[in-house]
C-alpha cells in the first residue's frame, strides 16, 4: 500500500471514558495535526476510516458498524458508543484517505470501571475557586454534543457520595453548581449525573471534577521575605560554613510564577567563582498560599566571602522584593593576662 | 431558638424622609456561625413580601443584595454578638414598611427557617 | 433579574378541600424554591424548601412539586386555621460583571376557607 503520514500513537490524549455509559470520541487529526477540518477533507474526496487495536493484542482490526443498536457508530469525524463497554479499551484509529492522501493517527482508549460513589481510576480535572470570595460556579464538562438543544436533561450533582441537596451555600443550577461562598470544607470531588433519553433509551453521563479552595486574589499580597530580616546577624569566623536562609510567603495567585533567587555582590551564585551551593524547598498551605526557602550554603567560609553583599530576593505577579543578610566576621575575643600579685598583706 | 428584633428608637422607628436607622437582629439560643445567612425582608402595609438581601454570619461577611438596594442600605453582623444589622440611609416614604430578620440555614434553597418578629419603620415628615 | 409571578389570587374552597397554588418563574430556577404562610400581624412561616421538601413541623398536607419555570403548591384537606397569604420565594445566581444572588418572592396568594 501506499505510504501514509503517520503521526504515531498520540498518548497526549489519553481518553478515558466510563463503561455503560455513551462516548463521543472525535478524531484527533483534525483537532491537532492538519490544518483544516473534516468539512473541507470530505469536500475533497477524502474518506475517514477507523480501526482499532485490541487491548494487549498487536493485531489491526476494522471497528464493528453493525453490532445490535448502532452501539458503536461514526458520524462525521466522531466515533460514538452508545453505551462503552469495557472490552472496548485498546488503542484506535483514524485515517484519512484517498487515491494520492494518506495521514492517520492512533490515540488509546481506556473504559473505565466507577462504583456507586462515582470513585474510579479517572484523572480528574481540578476546579480552583477562590476563597470567600463571593459566588462562583462549575460547569458539568465535556457533555457538548451528547443530546440536540430541544431535548431538557436531567442533572444531579453529588458531593463525593452525597446528593447536593440543602448543601449550605451551594446552589444546584442544571448543569452549573454556583459556590455562593467557597470555604475549605467545600474542598473534595464533585459529580454531575446527566440524564437524557435518545430513541427510547435513557442515558446518563458522569462527569467528576475536584474543586480545591485556593487563596483569594483579594487578600494576595506581594513576597514577604521573612528571612534574612534586621534581626538575625550571621557571624562566622574564616573556614566556618555559613548558612542562609531566605524564606519567602507568596499569597496564592493564578497562573503566578513564583521566584527566589540569591545574588552575592549583585551577581548570581552561577556568575561567581566561591563554592556555594544552594537548595530549595517548598510547602503550600491549605489555600495553596506557598513558602519558599532558598538556603544559601558556603562550607569553608573566608574572610573576603564575610565582606560580600547577600542579597535575597523574590518575584511573584505582585511584585519584587529584597532583603540583604547581616554577614559579618566575628571578632576574636581579647585574651587577657592576669597577674595575681601576692603578699600585699598588712604588716 | 429566636431572632430578637431591635432598632427604631424611643419614636418606634419613625424617621424623616432623607433620615438613616438601623435595625439589629440578635440570635438567642443558637450562635450565628458558618453555618447561617441573616437575611433580611420587608413587607410595606398591605403589600406582598419584597427581599432586600443577606450577609453570609461566618467570618468574611460577604453580601449580596437586591438590585433596587442600589447602595442605600447596608448589612453588617457581629459574631462575637450573634447580631447582624441592617442599617437603612436616604430613607423615603416608600421605605414605610415592617422589616423582618430571617435566618437562612442553606441560602441555596432559600429555607429562611426561623424569623425576627418585625420592626416597623415609619418615613414621614 | 428574577421575577416571580404566582397566580391566583384570591382562592378560596371549603374546609376538607383541595386548593392548588401556582408559580411561575421568569428562568428557570431548577428547583431552587421556597413556600411561606403568612397570617397577619406576623412573621411569614417556611413551609416547603428545594421545591418539594417539607420543612420540619409542617403537616403532611401541605406539599410542592415543580421545576425549572413552574412550581404548584398544593393544601389538601383544607382546615380553617390554614386561612393565610401564601408566597413562593425563587431563588438563582447571576455571572456577569457583578456576580450576584436573586431571592424573589412571588406577589403572594390570598387563601380563603370557606
Known amino acids: 500500500s501506499e505510504r501514509c503520514d503517520d503521526w504515531g500513537l498520540d498518548t497526549m490524549r489519553q481518553i478515558q471514558v466510563f463503561e455503560d455509559e455513551p462516548a463521543r470520541i472525535k478524531c484527533p487529526l483534525f483537532e491537532h495535526f492538519l490544518k483544516f477540518n473534516y468539512s473541507t477533507a470530505h469536500s475533497a474526496g477524502l474518506t475517514l476510516i477507523w480501526y482499532w487495536t485490541r487491548q494487549d493484542r498487536d493485531l489491526e482490526e476494522p471497528i464493528n458498524f453493525r453490532l445490535p443498536e448502532n452501539r458503536i457508530s461514526k458520524e462525521k469525524d466522531v466515533l460514538w458508543f452508545r453505551p462503552t463497554l469495557l472490552n472496548d479499551t485498546g488503542n484506535y484509529t483514524c485515517m484519512l484517505r484517498n487515491t494520492t492522501y494518506c495521514s492517520k493517527v492512533a490515540f488509546p482508549l481506556e473504559v473505565v470501571q466507577k462504583d456507586s460513589c462515582f470513585n474510579s481510576p479517572m484523572k480528574l480535572p481540578v476546579h480552583k475557586l477562590y476563597i470567600e470570595y463571593g459566588i462562583q460556579r462549575i460547569t458539568c464538562p465535556n457533555v457538548d454534543g451528547y443530546f440536540p438543544s430541544s431535548v431538557k436533561p436531567t442533572i444531579t450533582w453529588y458531593m463525593g457520595c452525597y446528593k447536593i441537596q440543602n448543601f449550605n451555600n451551594v446552589i444546584p443550577e442544571g448543569m452549573n453548581l454556583s459556590f455562593l461562598i467557597a470555604l475549605i470544607s467545600n474542598n473534595g470531588n464533585y459529580t454531575c449525573v446527566v440524564t437524557y433519553p435518545e430513541n427510547g433509551r435513557t442515558f446518563h453521563l458522569t462527569r467528576t471534577l475536584t474543586v480545591k479552595v485556593v487563596g483569594s486574589p483579594k487578600n494576595a499580597v506581594p513576597p514577604v521575605i521573612h528571612s534574612p530580616n534586621d534581626h538575625v546577624v550571621y557571624e562566622k569566623e574564616p573556614g566556618e560554613e555559613l548558612l542562609i536562609p531566605c524564606t519567602v510567603y507568596f499569597s496564592f495567585l493564578m497562573d503566578s510564577r513564583n521566584e527566589v533567587w540569591w545574588t552575592i555582590d549583585g551577581k548570581k551564585p552561577d556568575d561567581i567563582t566561591i563554592d556555594v551551593t544552594i537548595n530549595e524547598s517548598i510547602s503550600h498551605s491549605r489555600t495553596e498560599d506557598e513558602t519558599r526557602t532558598q538556603i544559601l550554603s558556603i562550607k569553608k567560609v573566608t574572610s573576603e566571602d564575610l565582606k560580600r553583599s547577600y542579597v535575597c530576593h523574590a518575584r511573584s505577579a505582585k511584585g519584587e522584593v529584597a532583603k540583604a543578610a547581616k554577614v559579618k566576621q566575628k571578632v576574636p575575643a581579647p585574651r587577657y593576662t592576669v597577674e595575681l600579685a601576692c603578699g600585699f598583706g598588712a604588716t | 431558638q429566636q431572632l430578637e428584633q431591635s432598632g427604631g428608637g424611643a419614636e418606634g422607628g419613625l424617621v424623616k424622609p432623607g433620615g438613616s436607622l438601623e435595625l439589629c437582629c440578635k440570635a438567642?439560643?443558637?450562635?450565628?456561625?458558618?453555618?447561617?445567612?441573616i437575611c433580611w425582608v420587608r413587607q410595606a402595609p398591605g403589600k406582598g413580601l419584597e427581599w432586600i438581601g443577606c450577609?453570609?454570619?461566618?467570618?468574611?461577611?460577604?453580601?449580596y443584595y437586591a438590585s433596587w438596594v442600589s447602595g442605600r442600605f447596608t448589612l453588617s453582623r457581629d459574631i462575637d454578638q450573634s447580631t447582624g444589622c441592617l442599617q437603612l440611609n436616604s430613607l423615603t416614604a416608600a421605605d414605610t414598611a415592617m422589616y423582618y430578620c430571617?435566618?437562612?440555614?442553606?441560602?441555596?434553597?432559600?429555607?429562611?427557617?426561623?424569623w425576627g418578629q418585625g420592626t416597623l419603620v415609619t418615613v414621614s415628615s | 433579574a428574577l421575577v416571580m409571578t404566582q397566580t391566583p389570587s384570591p382562592v378560596s374552597a371549603a374546609v376538607g378541600g383541595t386548593v392548588t397554588i401556582n408559580c411561575q418563574a421568569s428562568?428557570?430556577?431548577?428547583?431552587?424554591l421556597a413556600w411561606f404562610q403568612q397570617k397577619p400581624g406576623q412573621p411569614p412561616k417556611l413551609l416547603i424548601y428545594?421545591?418539594?421538601t417539607l420543612a420540619s413541623g409542617v403537616p403532611s398536607r401541605f406539599s410542592g412539586s415543580g421545576s425549572g419555570t413552574e412550581f404548584t403548591l398544593t393544601i389538601s384537606g383544607l382546615q380553617s386555621d390554614d386561612a393565610a397569604a401564601y408566597y413562593c420565594?425563587?431563588?438563582?445566581?447571576?455571572?456577569?460583571?457583578?456576580?450576584?444572588?436573586?431571592?424573589?418572592f412571588g406577589g403572594g396568594t390570598e387563601v380563603v376557607v370557606k
Open positions: 428545594q421545591a418539594s
Open positions: 420565594l425563587g431563588v438563582c445566581t447571576y455571572i456577569g460583571a457583578d456576580n450576584t444572588l436573586y431571592n424573589t
Open positions: 428562568e428557570d430556577i431548577y428547583s431552587n
Open positions: 430571617a435566618r437562612d440555614i442553606y441560602a441555596s434553597t432559600s429555607g429562611y427557617d426561623l
Open positions: 438567642s439560643g443558637f450562635s450565628l456561625g458558618s453555618s447561617y445567612w
Open positions: 450577609i453570609y454570619a461566618g467570618s468574611s461577611g460577604i453580601t
